[in-house]
Interface confidence: low
């Protein structure tokens, strides 16, 4: 009675079970009755992830220099590889097919998380008592100058994009 | 001033070998992908093959592919061009050229190319 | 594989005149980073090619104004303003938006 169903880790053809290639591994030939399933090693900069009956290697991912990849982690025969961002852009997407610059935090806006290869930067607005006078993709809120603790006193106020102007305090005869 | 200066090319008979190497200079060679690009006498031009800076990456034309094999030797400074089971359809002047990058994709500086005959 | 055509093959102008080769391609250069992958290339007579328009319209370092590229997709346009016979030679076009880049079959410029 030819099977239904196979084991773990093989495959139903004509009428009979083959065992599956291993990862790092693509098909050559169907098992026969006589002979067993037909496998060949992926070539360098191909791969197969699974258990599998492919007849063709997966093509590693190019991280292209052209759109701002680099390598973050090289494939090998069972594992693509992982594309990264260069220094100062980030990713457009989870599967980070390109990359952008990372985004500045315009005056009036401070950095609440610096960007990495895989996320932009985190702007906040600068809270009353702060400031950022800079287009930064670094640079946080910077608190106003106080002006008591020079002896002086405020002549401008502060805004989220200006620091407080102290000057003298004005002396009564 | 970036300068690349191809060496290797000569006459050859069908189905023999030839290697093709790129001095480069003037940059940092490590940094950039290279590419070779051939043009057959009085033709245009095709792409061959390129290499990504590392050299984990390396795609070549189907016209070449599973004859031809580029590789780098970043220590050497030198990028190669290994041909094997030459073909008269391969006679041309081989250029090997460096990868712009992110802002000029594609070939941007050249060699003054190699030329390679390949006949009986 | 992307297949780049070229019009006209070949083009005769005068000194100080105007001249515009078309180039397409058979599937967009346009990448999802807003940018044409396109490249465009003048050879000289007896010399190594020489890149003049990167992404479809960035002047390459040390090449005259008098050069232009536009275009989005897969139709582009190499322009010189006012030809100097300098410029002869052969123009290609060539796609670096995926392996195997491919160029055009060129366009041959000519002073009248």
């Known amino acids: 009675e030819p099977p239904t169903a196979c084991r773990e880790k093989q495959y139903l053809i004509n009428s009979q079970c083959c065992s599956l290639c291993q990862p790092g591994q693509k098909l050559v030939s169907d098992c026969t009755e006589f002979t067993e399933t037909e496998c060949l090693p992926c070539s360098e900069s191909e791969f197969l992830d699974t258990w599998n009956r492919e007849t063709r290697c997966h093509q590693h991912k190019y991280c292209d220099p052209n759109l701002g990849l680099q390598v973050q982690q090289k494939g090998t025969s069972e594992t693509d590889t992982i594309c990264t961002c260069e220094e100062g852009l980030h990713c457009t997407s989870e599967s980070c097919e390109s990359c952008v610059p990372h985004r500045s935090c315009l005056p009036g806006f401070g950095v609440k998380q610096i960007a990495t290869g895989v996320s932009d930067t985190i702007c906040e607005p600068c809270p009353v008592g702060f400031f950022s006078n800079v287009s930064s993709a670094f640079e946080k809120c910077r608190p106003w100058t106080s002006c008591e603790t020079k002896d002086l006193v405020v002549q401008q106020a502060g805004t989220n994009k200006t620091d407080v102007v102290c000057g003298p305090q004005d002396r009564q005869r | 001033q970036v300068q690349l200066v191809e060496s290797g090319g000569g006459v050859v008979q069908p189905g023999r070998s030839l290697r093709l190497s790129c001095a480069a200079s003037?940059?940092?060679?490590?940094?950039?992908?290279m590419h070779w690009v051939r043009q057959a006498p009085g033709k245009g031009l095709e792409w061959v093959a390129v290499?990504?800076?590392?050299?984990?990456?390396?795609y070549h034309a189907d016209s070449v592919k599973g004859r031809f094999t580029i590789s780098r030797d970043n220590s050497k400074i030198t990028l190669y061009l290994q041909m094997n089971s030459l073909r008269t359809e391969d006679t041309a002047v081989y250029y090997c050229?460096?990868?712009?990058?992110?802002?000029?994709?594609?070939?941007?500086?050249w060699g003054q190319g190699t030329l390679v005959t390949v006949s009986s | 594989d992307i297949v780049m055509t070229q019009s006209p093959l070949s083009l005769t102008v005068t000194p100080g005149e105007p001249a515009s080769i078309s180039c397409r391609s058979s599937?967009?250069?346009?990448?999802?980073?807003?940018?044409?992958?396109l490249d465009w290339y003048l050879q000289k007579p007896g010399q190594s090619p020489q890149v003049l328009i990167s992404?479809?319209?960035n002047r390459a370092s040390g090449v005259p104004d008098r050069f232009s590229g536009s275009g989005s997709g897969t139709d582009f346009t190499l322009k010189i303003s006012r030809v100097e016979a300098e410029d002869v030679g052969v123009y290609y076009c060539?796609?670096?938006?995926?392996?195997?880049?491919?160029f055009g079959p060129g366009t041959k410029v000519d002073i009248r």
């Open positions: 050229a460096r990868d712009g990058g992110i802002a000029a994709p594609g070939p941007d500086y």
């Open positions: 003037g940059f940092t060679f490590s940094s950039y992908g």
């Open positions: 290499i990504s800076y590392e050299e984990s990456n390396r």
């Open positions: 599937q967009s250069l346009l990448y999802s980073n807003g940018y044409n992958y």
């Open positions: 992404l479809g319209s």
């Open positions: 060539m796609q670096a938006r995926q392996t195997p880049f491919t």
